[in-house]
Interface confidence: low
């Protein structure tokens, strides 16, 4: 799917030594300039121009700081384990100046039973051990360290989590005699947590767990975990909250019912219900009281178990997102679609919007893609005029405001971002779509009667003539 | 002068308990991972303990595990090591050393402090 | 546990030859490139130095004529030429897991 539309990525950089305990050398200073963006009110094309001109000035005092590379480090408890029993580790990226520490839960589906996560192990080992990981990984989108591409926190410390257990981050199983995998994505979580303690996170104000599809869904399953944590171990002042990109999905009715043969036909509701037994899942305990037992799987769907969250969750997604799709048999090869399909996909969104009513900090531009916060364009898109940087920007001052009275959102600040418009890609600032055969970018109007959208249907409700939603269209307005 | 000086060894009974330290100087104290290393009479290098810099995580040999606790005192530049339920296999030469930050290695040691269990 | 096996527990050098030391793994202690693999002197009454990290990564202030070379399970410490001052005991540590163990020691005699 990600081959369809056109990102950026940046090459990467050669790699330092790992770094088992993280610090400043002997006697060396400990400087930063931390900027913090809630007191940015004015021109931000102004300041960012000044920030790139101050960053740029001080480069050569200290190339090495620029560095935008996440260094490898393994968990010193190596009976944490990723699928094979190889020990799970994460990326890192310190920024001394700042008490901001971001931790992201890569995504890559779920495998469920032993012949389907043999078949993974052939083909993604990566997703399930560590034995092939790069010494180091470049942050991109608000992995990033640098302003202009991540506006929202380029000074925070960056961690990344790579997702080596298949079982969307919830599995609390070791590897055994009976068990030809360990499922332990819940208790990486909670390692990963306990190890950074010891290299600066004790120091930390916010934490904020973000992830991408399963990484996503990972977040919605352990923000409250994570907090618990925190608290226990004597750290109840770190504010822990949740940014969920791409892991909202619904159990709904697939638009051609298959049998549960494999991780992509098998229906979400089924997949999950096999997952949970296969990798001793767990839940939120808020969200598991409200279900009878063995109906964990209610919880790894978005609407369900978001109500039953204590941490602040901010939610982005797709209104058609392709990994949804592709769960619920949905597999658009490039054909004209067909009016009952058109009709499904539709009314997709339609459902999706309307689980995000009471979410009141969501992101949900009308795109057909999957994953947005880690791409190196995730500030191009806009909902309603506003960016995702600057929703989440505003979601921070709404958190920071919060104990006064006052639940009106902030002026001009709006952090309740759902499209409203009814098709994919009826927003222009959507991601660029290729056609999958010949690899041509497509524009929205191109896409749309690819996609056998008929021209008046969608005109009409906007009060256009055709002519006119083409030219639109066509100008990416 | 980076330096680590141990103090406080000494006989103890068996099933005894001794709290030993380990004072830090000349360096960050507080950004370094510690661990204690351990040197029968006569034997080889025996890894009895880790505490990370912030204090929050510790591990410990097996051998060890639920009779030592290893702890630290950041502002004072101390590293501790409180062994109880002391035997005989406890005897030995303890080191404090600092963790180096390019994967787990030892690049500072201390002198060491005995420790002899006995009656 | 990783157990390291240091096969030679005494080797008796002449001054100004070459001392090979070896140490191997009861599994590797590679990962992402990088082996966790550190060599250590110590003397009589002395604790421990640390003389090769990360297995041929020579520790600053420490004599070129200590090399420390290997991957996966086999590692090897060489000391060329070999001067009085090298009569020691020499130990392999690996930190690729918990817990970290050490070899039982080499002892470097002069002949």
């Known amino acids: 799917s990600e081959g369809r539309k056109t990102w950026r990525r940046r090459g990467q950089q050669p790699p330092p030594p790992p770094r088992t305990e993280a610090a400043p050398a002997a006697g060396q200073p400990v400087e930063s300039f931390p900027l913090d963006f809630t007191a940015v009110e004015g021109n931000m094309d102004s300041f960012m121009a000044q920030v790139k001109s101050l960053a740029q000035s001080l480069y050569p005092c200290s190339a090495q700081q620029l560095n935008e590379d996440l260094r490898l480090h393994l968990l010193l408890n190596t009976s944490v384990t990723c699928n094979d029993g190889s020990p799970a580790g994460y990326y890192l990226k310190e920024s001394r100046g700042s008490r901001r520490w971001l931790l992201f839960l890569e995504g890559g589906w779920y495998c469920f039973n032993r012949e389907n996560c043999d078949s993974r192990y052939d083909t993604m080992r990566r997703l399930m051990s560590s034995r092939d990981w790069p010494r180091t990984r470049t942050g991109t989108g608000i992995l990033s360290s640098q302003p202009e591409e991540n506006p929202y926190w380029w000074n925070a410390n960056m961690v990344f989590i790579p997702y080596c257990s298949s079982d969307v981050w919830s599995g609390a199983s070791s590897k055994s005699e009976k068990n030809e995998y360990a499922f332990m994505g819940a208790l990486i979580i909670q390692e990963v947590v306990r190890e950074l303690l010891g290299r600066g996170l004790s120091g930390a104000k916010v934490l904020l767990l973000a992830g991408s599809s399963a990484g996503g869904t990972g977040v919605l399953l352990n923000v409250d975990r994570v907090a618990e944590q925190l608290e226990k171990l004597g750290y109840p002042a770190i504010q822990v909250r949740g940014l969920a990109d791409s892991g909202w999905f619904l159990d709904n009715k697939q638009y051609r019912h298959t049998d549960c043969v494999d991780t992509i036909t098998c229906a979400p509701t089924e997949a999950i219900r096999r997952g949970i037994r296969y990798w001793n899942g767990v839940v939120p305990e808020r969200c598991r009281r409200q279900f009878q037992e063995g109906e964990e799987w209610n919880c790894f769907f978005g609407y369900k178990v978001y109500p039953t969250l204590r941490c602040p969750v901010f939610v982005v997604q797709w209104l058609f997102d392709e990994a949804q799709l592709t769960v619920d048999n949905v597999h658009l090869t490039g054909q004209p679609v067909q009016e009952g399909l058109r009709l499904y996909i539709q009314n997709l969104g339609r459902e999706l919007r309307h689980t995000l009513k009471d979410v009141p900090a969501s992101f949900a531009p009308a795109c057909l893609s999957h994953e947005i916060i880690i791409r190196s364009h995730w500030t191009d898109v806009q909902v309603k005029g506003t960016s995702l940087p600057r929703a989440l920007h505003c979601w921070d001052r709404s958190l920071h405001d919060s104990h006064k009275a006052s639940k009106t959102p902030l002026k001009g600040c709006p952090v309740h971002l759902v499209d409203s418009c009814p098709w994919p890609h009826c927003n222009p600032s959507c991601p660029t779509v290729r056609d999958q055969f010949t690899g041509q970018e497509m524009n929205v109007a191109q896409f749309l009667m690819h996609m056998g959208f008929d021209m008046q249907t969608v005109a009409q409700p906007q009060g256009l003539e055709p002519s006119e939603l083409l030219g639109m269209l066509s100008n990416g307005s | 002068d980076v330096q680590l000086v141990e103090s406080g060894g000494g006989l103890v009974q068996p099933g005894g308990s001794r709290k030993i330290s380990c004072a830090a100087s000349?360096?960050?104290?507080?950004?370094?991972?510690m661990h204690w290393v351990r040197q029968a009479p006569e034997k080889g290098l025996e890894w009895v303990a880790y505490i990370s810099s912030s204090t929050v995580t510790t591990y410990y040999a097996d051998t060890v595990k639920g009779r030592f606790t290893i702890s630290r005192d950041n502002a004072n530049n101390t590293l501790f090591l409180q062994m109880t339920s002391l035997r005989s296999e406890d005897t030995a030469m303890y080191y404090c050393?600092?963790?180096?930050?390019?994967?787990?290695?030892?690049?500072?040691w201390g002198a060491g402090t005995t420790v002899t269990v006995s009656s | 546990d990783i157990v390291l096996t240091q096969s030679l527990a005494s080797l008796a050098v002449s001054l100004g030859q070459r001392a090979t030391i070896s140490c191997r793994a009861s599994k590797s202690v590679s990962s992402s490139g990088y082996s966790y693999m550190h060599w250590y002197q110590q003397k009589p009454g002395q604790p421990p130095k640390l003389l090769i990290y990360?297995?041929?990564n020579l520790e600053s202030g420490v004599p070129a004529r200590f090399s420390g070379s290997g991957s996966g399970t086999d590692f090897t410490l060489n000391i060329h030429p070999v001067e009085e001052e090298d009569a020691a005991t020499y130990y392999c540590?690996?930190?690729?897991?918990?817990?970290?163990?050490f070899g039982a020691g080499t002892k470097l005699e002069l002949k």
């Open positions: 050393s600092r963790q180096n930050w390019d994967g787990g290695y030892f690049d500072v």
């Open positions: 000349g360096f960050t104290f507080s950004s370094y991972g």
């Open positions: 540590q690996h930190s690729r897991a918990l817990p970290l163990t």
């Open positions: 990360l297995a041929s």
